[in-house]
Interface confidence: medium
């Protein structure tokens, strides 16, 4: 048989198909059911659910679906030693205390096991002091307090609002601040949108709300106590005090009624401008301690949470391709939430469930993809993206060898306004073409592409007439597969207006008020949005599991490496006398920018006209387009983060949600003016450059004709 | 790469005024701290003062010694760092030193310059 | 102000001897942000001084592997392993952790 005829029995089976077959009543279905009770890694009720997805799988149609196992280190608060932050007075009394749990919302009032908010892995500690205001507690809000206004954070509490940057950064620069705590809180300016409700009535944040989640600095670690290395029954593992990623210092997050009371006192410093200024009626100011009558107070944490080597369990499905069965297309995303997961993860889940049983369906009719398709259910992502990492590292070296694509599906909205899509390069012209092959669901646009509702709504800052699609960072399971293997990836949501929604995530985002009614009554009571990212993440799945020559574009990389080196080449400028005085030169970062830009350009028209029907020609053309991501990895790493191998994209060391475009150079000039020795400084940068310079030399060197 | 030369110094009688200029080249000027040293023959180092950057509002701060006296200033434009010297002492004889400092180290010196304060 | 006290005053050596610089202050030199501002200089006659060492114990770049600084608190020490030609001159300390800055009253490297 033919290439074609193997995996198209019938005409009807193409991607129309497979499109037609996805449902949004299918998907609301699947998300009740994946919402009733809490899904938190490493317990019961997770593995009873791993368990479930898996018998599901098979009835679907998939040719083998597994449970892999882990033992990973998890973090859990005392159930009989609750952690709370109290103001005590002089006499050590405690004249208030933060709330010890979330009142859990109408009709889940009798549900067990709900976590009360902490802040995983946290050390145990009772450390008591003044409290220091440190605003977002990013690395410019630190600049501002130390340098600016001569604020010393040494021995201070820091209390710290969310937003704006992942909370494992703000963690680590109190740490390295000197803080002794950190108290995280959500205030109304970032996480309750005017005019909007508060929950049950709306999607804003109440009061006594809070948001969970881990506070590690992993750097693509995996599980803290082997990294590298896959957490099995032989695996050998670290003391807790070399463990990877955990924080030193007692943390914790609380709502912003409890923080009204602890910001209400503040006294000593004035906040420096209305960029530290939340929406609580509170003089922001920053401390260090309370005011006047009020001085002889301090804060005090309890932390007594404990962590442990847990058992997690993901789900791996695999759809067996016909033509070429050993490169891999995968689609992800986690199970495992913090309390009901309404959002996160679980409508993201919802979608990869519709997706498995529609690829069934059509396999049930004797269709199979060109190459394989691997799903999987990932458990503890909420715990440092601990289950995808696990598995990537045992299967490290088929991955490499085999990977063609990943395609993350964590929540499918965190809005209900526009398509959000980050990806590689290479798959801007799939994304693009399918969009435009796609109905919109956005009101207004009836009839209308989901291109032209994309791009209107999100347009381009570069081109017009083309929408927006941003850089992978990280705080996803896609992490490892991008940032350590170098396999193409990419991910698509619904999201909010960023233009008129300022808040940081969605308002609910890992507190117990995320759950089923809040997506059915305020995000998307037709589940429509949630059907049009079903179609975006398996339409993308669809095509690089069967598109013959593979859907991957490699001029676009060009493009985008041209904007990376003259963004940072315009950094670097920023100090010219230094760049003369030790001969700081980006020459050669851009002549191997040209170069590759025209080895692109060749391999495109060699690609657009080679013989389709040879198949080993073909093989040929598609591995170099699978290599090409590949080709990227730098198999040192970066700077103090050997996991983050990729030399164009890494998470930003300020903000693991962000992506940096050539990070190693981004980084050795990063505040480059405060190094004690510029000499040394401004040679890493030269270095860094040459390292940039010599993988894009490379990757564009495996594009070149074979022979 | 970083240079700093002191100018200005000379012989002087007690009570006169004198001033030394440090003109620099190689980094960045206005990114930086800039302080005078001096050194008394046969005597250990004494810091004297130091200027803060624009966004600091070119703040200064002296050593008791010569505080009341002595005046530093910058001009961003020329990359310079001045010392004004008045009501000169004897005790004010040294070899003049500006530094370029980097958070709380003084990385670069100049060669320094002589100031001999005699009748 | 903080008081630094350096010795020996002399340190007669011969090349390719290992020798030792001690440093104390009258106070503790750790900055309440947990660093400590103690660095050593080389000035040789007629020239400005030579950042060596920078907060106890990092090496300035372009000097030798042969010079190490250690210690904390109060006390402090710049070795040289193998004392060669070119590091004869006078050695002095600096403390930035305390204003105003202060400067050990050196140590002479000559040849025994």
């Known amino acids: 048989k033919s290439s074609s005829e193997a995996t198209n029995i019938t005409p009807k089976h193409n991607m129309k198909a497979f499109l037609d077959e996805l449902k949004a009543e299918n998907i609301k279905k699947f998300l009740h059911n994946f919402t009733q009770i809490p899904h938190l890694a490493g317990t019961e009720q997770n593995f009873q659910l791993a368990k479930q997805i898996q018998s599901q799988w098979k009835e679907f149609g998939l040719d083998s679906v597994e449970l892999t196992h882990y033992d990973v280190l998890l973090s859990y608060p005392n159930k009989t030693h609750p952690n709370y932050i109290s103001i005590i007075n002089e006499d050590g009394n405690e004249i208030f205390n933060t709330s010890l749990f979330e009142p859990p919302p109408a009709g889940y009032e009798n549900v067990s096991d709900i976590v009360p908010p902490f802040s995983a892995f946290s050390p145990q500690g009772m450390p008591e002091g003044d409290l220091v205001y440190v605003n977002y507690a990013r690395t410019e809000d630190f600049f501002k307090l130390e340098r600016d206004m001569k604020i010393n954070c040494s021995g201070k509490i820091v209390i710290a609002r969310y937003g704006k940057v992942f909370r494992g950064n703000k963690v680590k620069n109190a740490q390295l601040a000197g803080a002794t705590g950190v108290i995280l809180y959500s205030d109304p300016a970032d996480y309750f949108a005017p005019g909007v409700k508060s929950y049950p009535d709306g999607w804003n944040l109440p009061g006594g709300g809070v948001q969970r989640g881990n506070i590690l600095n992993l750097n693509g670690a995996g599980d803290p106590l082997t990294p590298g290395y896959p957490a099995n029954e032989y695996a050998y593992r670290r003391g807790i005090a070399e463990a990877v990623g955990l924080p030193s210092i007692p943390v914790h997050p609380i709502g912003y009624y409890d923080a009204q009371k602890l910001l209400e006192k503040m006294g000593g410093s004035a906040s420096p401008d209305s960029s530290w200024r939340g929406s609580l009626k509170v003089p922001y100011n920053v401390g260090p301690g309370f005011t006047g009558n009020f001085s002889t107070q301090k804060v005090k944490m309890h932390i007594h949470s404990t962590s442990e080597v847990t058992r997690i369990y993901n789900v791996i499905g695999t759809l067996r391709g016909a033509v070429e069965p050993d490169r891999y297309v995968i689609l992800g995303g986690h199970r495992d939430s913090w309390v009901f997961g309404g959002i996160d993860p679980q409508s993201g889940a919802a979608v990869v469930h519709e997706i498995v049983r529609s690829f069934g369906t059509l396999k049930k009719e004797g269709w199979r993809p060109r190459r394989t398709i691997l799903f999987a259910s990932w458990d503890a992502e909420e715990f440092g993206l601990l289950g995808s990492t696990e598995w990537a590292e045992e299967n490290s070296r088929l991955l490499q060898e085999r990977g063609v694509a990943y395609i993350n599906a964590d929540s499918s909205i965190e809005g209900n306004y526009t398509l959000r899509v980050d990806c590689t390069p290479l798959m801007y012209s799939l994304v693009y073409n399918l969009t435009k092959e796609l109905e919109s669901p956005d009101e207004g646009f009836e009839g209308k592409s989901l291109y032209e509702s994309w791009t209107k709504k999100s347009p381009s800052p570069e081109f017009s007439g083309m929408p927006r699609i941003s850089k992978l960072g990280s705080g996803n399971d896609f992490e490892v597969f991008f940032q350590r293997l170098g396999i193409a990836s990419g991910r698509a949501r619904y999201t909010k207006n960023w233009e008129t929604n300022k808040f940081s995530s969605y308002p609910l985002y890992h507190s117990v008020y995320e759950t089923y009614e809040l997506v059915e009554k305020f995000y998307d009571p037709m589940f429509k949005y949630h059907l049009t990212v079903a179609q975006v993440r398996g339409g993308m799945v669809f095509e690089l599991a069967n598109s013959v020559v593979l859907p991957f574009d490699c001029r676009d990389y060009a493009v985008v490496l041209r904007k990376y080196a003259d963004k940072i080449y315009n950094i670097s400028m920023k100090h010219p006398q230094e760049m003369k005085t030790y001969s700081v030169s980006f020459d050669s970062l851009f002549s191997a920018v040209k170069n590759f830009t025209e080895i692109a350009s060749k391999f495109s028209e060699r690609l657009r006209d080679f013989d389709k029907s040879n198949p080993i020609l073909l093989r040929m053309m598609n591995d170099q387009l699978m290599f090409l991501e590949r080709a990227f990895i730098d198999p040192l790493g970066l700077p103090d983060r050997p996991f983050y191998r990729h030399v164009i994209y890494a998470p930003s060391s300020h903000n693991k949600y962000a992506g940096e475009s050539f990070p190693g150079i981004y980084d050795a000039l990063f505040d480059i003016e405060s190094k004690v020795d510029p000499s040394q400084a401004w040679g890493e940068v030269k270095r860094q450059i040459s390292i940039a310079t010599f993988t894009v030399q490379a990757a564009a060197e495996t594009l070149s004709e074979v022979a | 790469q970083v240079q700093l030369v002191e100018t200005g110094g000379g012989l002087v009688r007690p009570g006169n005024s004198l001033k030394l200029s440090c003109v620099t080249s190689?980094?960045?000027?206005?990114?930086?701290?800039m302080h005078w040293l001096r050194q008394p023959p046969g005597k250990r180092l004494e810091w004297i003062a130091v200027i803060t950057v624009k966004s600091d509002n070119y703040g200064s701060s002296y050593a008791e010694s010569v505080k009341g006296r002595f005046a530093i200033s910058r001009d961003d434009s020329k990359s310079s760092v001045y010392l004004e010297m008045n009501r000169l002492r004897e005790e004010d004889t040294a070899t003049y030193f500006c530094?370029?400092?980097?958070?709380?180290?003084?990385?670069?010196w100049g060669q320094g310059t002589l100031v001999t304060v005699s009748a | 102000d903080v008081v630094v006290t350096q010795t020996p005053l002399s340190l007669p050596v011969s090349l390719g001897d290992q020798a030792s610089i001690s440093c104390r202050s009258s106070?503790?030199?750790?900055?309440?942000?947990?660093?400590?501002?103690l660095h050593w200089y080389l000035q040789k006659p007629g020239q400005s001084p030579k950042l060596l060492i920078y907060?106890?114990?990092n090496r300035f770049s372009g000097v030798p592997d042969r010079f190490s600084g250690s210690g904390s608190g109060t006390d402090f020490t710049l070795k040289i392993s193998r004392v060669e030609a070119e590091d004869l001159g006078v050695y002095f300390c600096?403390?930035?952790?305390?204003?105003?800055?202060?400067f050990g009253g050196g140590t002479k490297l000559e040849i025994k």
């Open positions: 530094s370029r400092e980097l958070g709380q180290v003084l990385v670069f």
């Open positions: 190689g980094f960045t000027f206005s990114n930086y701290r």
């Open positions: 907060k106890v114990s």
């Open positions: 106070q503790s030199l750790v900055h309440s942000y947990g660093n400590t501002y």
């Open positions: 600096s403390q930035t952790t305390h204003v105003p800055w202060t």
